[in-house]
Interface confidence: low
């Protein structure tokens, strides 16, 4: 089953809406939900059998300008005894996200959509075993 | 000092950056990076010790209009024998993403940004045990 990505190539037309004239839309600068204190639960990163850390990337010409990227702490997974089990693999779960890029860089009020593949956290998987013929 | 345009306060400009004209920015919706063949690896969802499925949400007034949300398959985690181990918990990793919301709904080329908390995949964690006093 094909899974749609978070960055479909063109803005879907709602019903019989005509196409956009110049590939640009106007976006209100208020951000809906911005004050809801929505935050990504961080406590899982240490309790997981595939723990991870966050690296913060900063880019003032991007919105959001600060993005946290996950990095798996081990190649294997942590077992019930707290030891690394190399028969399993810690892998990063990736999510395609949309960001806005100031264009041209500087104080322009024009942006363009940009796709980013973000490592969000890690999960423990069974490795794919390639059998010898 | 009266400013003729409602909602557009006059500004002393530092540098050469003009103020926003009408509380909106222009966004080019041609997505940079869209042809790089970026795709989210989906095979982890079944091989994980905390497997998950995807539910597709569709909203023609949102961009992207289709978003895949993860749902953990089990409350516990899958052990090496393929059995569910209820001493561990499958939990969803969440990521805050930006989407564009058509406003008002219809054919308008005006949008607003909206934050969404998206379940991206699942990871296996040690439960928090509350000790009896």
């Amino acid at each position: 089953r094909k899974n749609p990505k978070a960055g479909v190539p063109a803005l879907q037309k709602a019903g019989n809406c005509p196409p956009l004239e110049d590939n640009t839309v106007r976006v209100d600068i208020r951000i809906f939900n911005q004050n809801q204190g929505i935050s990504v639960p961080r406590e899982f990163q240490n309790r997981s059998s595939s723990p991870w850390d966050y690296n913060i990337t900063r880019d003032p010409h991007r919105f959001p300008s600060e993005i946290a990227e996950a990095q798996c702490r081990h190649s294997g997974c942590i077992n019930a005894q707290g030891q690394e089990d190399s028969t399993m693999n810690s892998v990063a779960i990736q999510q395609e996200i949309l960001v806005l890029r100031r264009e041209p860089q500087g104080c322009s009020n024009s942006f363009r959509l940009e796709k980013m593949l973000l490592k969000v956290g890690c999960t423990c998987v069974k490795p794919i075993v390639h059998q010898a013929a | 000092r009266k400013n003729p345009k409602a909602g557009v306060p006059a500004l002393q400009k530092a540098g050469n950056c003009p103020p926003l004209e009408d509380n909106t920015v222009r966004v080019d919706i041609r997505i940079f990076n869209q042809n790089q063949g970026i795709s989210v690896p989906r095979e982890f969802q079944n091989r994980s010790s905390s497997p998950w499925d995807y539910n597709i949400t569709r909203d023609p007034h949102r961009f992207p209009s289709e978003i895949a949300e993860a749902q953990c398959r089990h409350s516990g985690c899958i052990n090496a024998q393929g059995q569910e181990d209820s001493t561990m918990n499958s939990v969803a990793i969440q990521q805050e993403i930006l989407v564009l919301r058509r406003e008002p709904q219809g054919c308008s080329n005006s949008f607003r940004l909206e934050k969404m908390l998206l379940k991206v995949g699942c990871t296996c964690v040690k439960p928090i045990v509350h000790q009896a006093a």
Partner: antibody, heavy 123, light 108 residues
Framework: EVQLVESGGGLVQPGRSLRLSCAAS????????MHWVRQAPGKGLEWVSG????????GYADSVKGRFTISRDNAKNSLYLQMNSLRAEDTALYYC????????????????WGRGTLVTVSS | EIVLTQSPATLSLSPGERATLSCRAS??????LAWYQQKPGQAPRLLIY???NRATGIPARFSGSGSGTDFTLTISSLEPEDFAVYYC??????????FGGGTKVEIK
């Protein structure tokens, strides 16, 4: 925790200077325009000054223009207000406030406030 | 400069009653009007923006209406924590953020 903490207030003589600071935490500072709003004892609110994400847009109330200077240091998550030639009528509680606009631009509504720092101008 | 006049200056009501606060602008501010709540010793809190949009986390008992020069903040049923001073603010003209003088809602 998302918060703004003001500092630098105090008792100062007329004609002297004072520099207020606002330390932001819990959010990405340069994603927001920032403002100073003041409140004289027992009185209402008065917007003083605002600055957008990259200091490209700056505004002042007529009552402080030419005397006060707003600035920000995004690397330090800090907002400042340099107040020169202070007058008795500048006596107030000074609040640091975050604009509710996105992209670091002005929307001119204030969605997050600090607790304020008191400035008293008296001889 | 646009002047915002709030009335009444003081509103004495009991918990459970409906509160209606008025804000009148000296010239049209279209729908660019916000309402803030301030409790003693605390910073203001945004309640309503652009005349009728509730800020995030604000209870449904608070609602705003109006456009042009006449605006109303309504608290459908007063809770004990709602007794405070309420300010309106316009963002339509220079200076970009002027406030009304405030309405104090006190317990009768």
């Amino acid at each position: 925790e998302v918060q703004l903490v003001e500092s630098g207030g105090g008792l100062v003589q007329p004609g002297r200077s004072l520099r207020l600071s606002c330390a932001a935490s819990g959010f990405t500072f340069d994603d927001y325009a920032m403002h100073w709003v003041r409140q004289a004892p027992g009185k209402g609110l008065e917007w003083v000054s605002g600055i957008n994400w990259n200091s490209g847009g700056i505004g002042y109330a007529d009552s402080v223009k030419g005397r006060f200077t707003i600035s920000r240091d995004n690397a330090k998550n800090s907002l400042y207000l340099q107040m020169n030639s202070l007058r008795a009528e500048d006596t107030a509680l000074y609040y640091c406030a975050r604009d509710m606009g996105g992209f670091g631009e002005f929307y001119w509504n204030f969605g997050l406030w600090g607790r304020g720092t008191l400035v008293t101008v008296s001889s | 400069e646009i002047v915002l006049t709030q009335s009444p200056a003081t509103l004495s009501l009991s918990p459970g009653e409906r509160a209606t606060l008025s804000c009148r602008a000296s010239q049209s501010v279209r729908s660019y009007l916000a309402w803030y709540q301030q409790k003693p010793g605390q910073a203001p809190r945004l309640l309503i923006y652009d005349a009728s949009n509730r800020a995030t986390g604000i209870p449904a008992r608070f609602s705003g209406s109006g456009s042009g020069t006449d605006f109303t903040l309504t608290i459908s049923s007063l809770e004990p924590e709602d007794f405070a001073v309420y300010y309106c603010q316009q963002r339509s003209n220079w200076p970009p953020a002027t406030f009304g003088g405030g309405t104090k809602v006190e317990i009768k």
